[in-house]
């Protein structure tokens, strides 16, 4: 069957959002993707979702990200504007109204969204062929 | 393929105006940034303007400000510099570039030659 | 403004050199600091932005080190493509500024 719409948003946001790091894509997340063997596809996609969305309420106004230049101010600001259009497309992809994250292990934002884009491809690969 | 295209370089009298043209494709041109770098002959680089194209607002240079104008089309995908009292120390390469999405400017373009003479 | 200093403006090299190129800012700009390679005839390629990341592409014979005022871009192992002159730049607030290059060629 054709490759989601969708699918192919979040991987181009994805690719964007990993071509560069920032001080502030070094930061922490929940790691979803430690022990995600009984997790189906769509909670997958719901959990990253619910990661990103903590990520961005928390440091939306985070000074340590925020800068103290306008210049840096555009570049979280660009930041926050690509996790909340990954947020809102894997939201779409996954179709869950909630999903718990629980766990304990963390990781950087940065390796978390490498680790998203290497699922998404795996996704895509297969929806293609 | 990300690509930017330059044009509308050329030959003016000093006191003229000339507007360049810079086509972008292969990406979302409204989810980076764009510059304008000069380089005069034989010398180095310097920064003229940015623009934020989800907003439209430029950030000019001093020595800019007032002369020199950066808009947008963003159903061409395409960004302008309206250069106007053109000064014989305005001759140069005009590169138009791309922000990275964090940091630096990530493609360029080929470069188009004003040159302001009598 | 910020001024960007490069020194030194040029230097002659062999290959297989190492060589080390400095940049000092007028005043602190954290790490928001990137180097570009230009070729003759050329548009300026990004290698380094935040002082020490290299750009998609870029071999690992490039590194960018420093903070605050000093930075530093090193060629571990000089290649005959790499005959260049190489900028830094600020990005750290507006204007954005470029240093003065540095040319490097062939001794």
């Known amino acids: 069957h054709k490759c989601d719409i969708t699918l192919q948003e979040i991987i181009k946001t994805l690719n964007s959002l990993t071509e560069q790091k920032t001080l502030c894509t070094e930061l922490t997340v929940t790691d979803i993707f430690a022990a995600s063997k009984n997790t189906t596809e769509k909670e997958t996609f719901c959990r990253a979702a619910t990661v990103l969305r903590q990520f961005y309420s928390h440091h939306e106004k985070d000074t340590r990200c925020l800068g103290a230049t306008a210049q840096q101010f555009h570049r979280h600001k660009q930041l926050i504007r690509f996790l909340k259009r990954l947020d809102r497309n894997l939201w779409g992809l996954a179709g869950l109204n909630s999903c718990p994250v629980k766990e304990a292990n963390q990781s950087t934002l940065e390796n978390f969204l490498e680790r998203l884009k290497t699922i998404m491809r795996e996704k895509y690969s297969k929806c293609s062929s | 393929e990300v690509q930017l295209v330059e044009s509308g370089g050329g030959l003016v009298q000093p006191g003229g105006s000339l507007r360049l043209s810079c086509a972008a494709s292969?990406?979302?041109?409204?989810?980076?940034?764009m510059h304008w770098v000069r380089q005069a002959p034989g010398k180095g680089l310097e920064w003229v303007v940015w623009i934020n194209t989800e907003t439209g607002e430029p950030t000019y240079a001093d020595d800019f400000k007032g002369r020199f104008t950066f808009s947008l089309d963003n159903s061409k995908n395409t960004a302008y510099l309206q250069m106007n009292s053109l000064r014989a120390e305005d001759t140069a390469v005009y590169y138009c570039?791309?922000?990275?999405?964090?940091?630096?400017?990530?493609?360029w373009g080929q470069g188009t030659l004003v040159t302001v003479s009598s | 403004d910020i001024q960007m200093t490069q020194s030194p403006s040029s230097l002659s090299a062999s290959v297989g050199d190492r060589v080390t190129i400095t940049c000092k800012a007028s005043?602190?700009?954290?790490?928001?600091a990137a180097w570009y390679q230009q070729k003759p005839g050329k548009a300026p390629k990004l290698l380094i932005y935040?002082?020490?990341h290299r750009y998609t592409g870029v071999p690992s014979r490039f590194s960018g080190s420093g903070s605050g005022t000093d930075f530093t871009l090193t060629i571990s192992s000089l290649q005959p493509e790499d005959f260049a002159t190489y900028y830094c730049?600020?990005?750290?607030?507006?204007?954005?500024?470029f240093g003065q290059g540095t040319k490097v060629e062939i001794k």
């Open positions: 570039a791309r922000g990275g999405i964090f940091y630096g400017m990530d493609y």
């Open positions: 730049q600020q990005d750290y607030t507006s204007p954005w500024t």
């Open positions: 292969g990406y979302t041109f409204t989810d980076y940034s």
């Open positions: 005043q602190s700009v954290i790490n928001d």
């Open positions: 935040y002082t020490s």
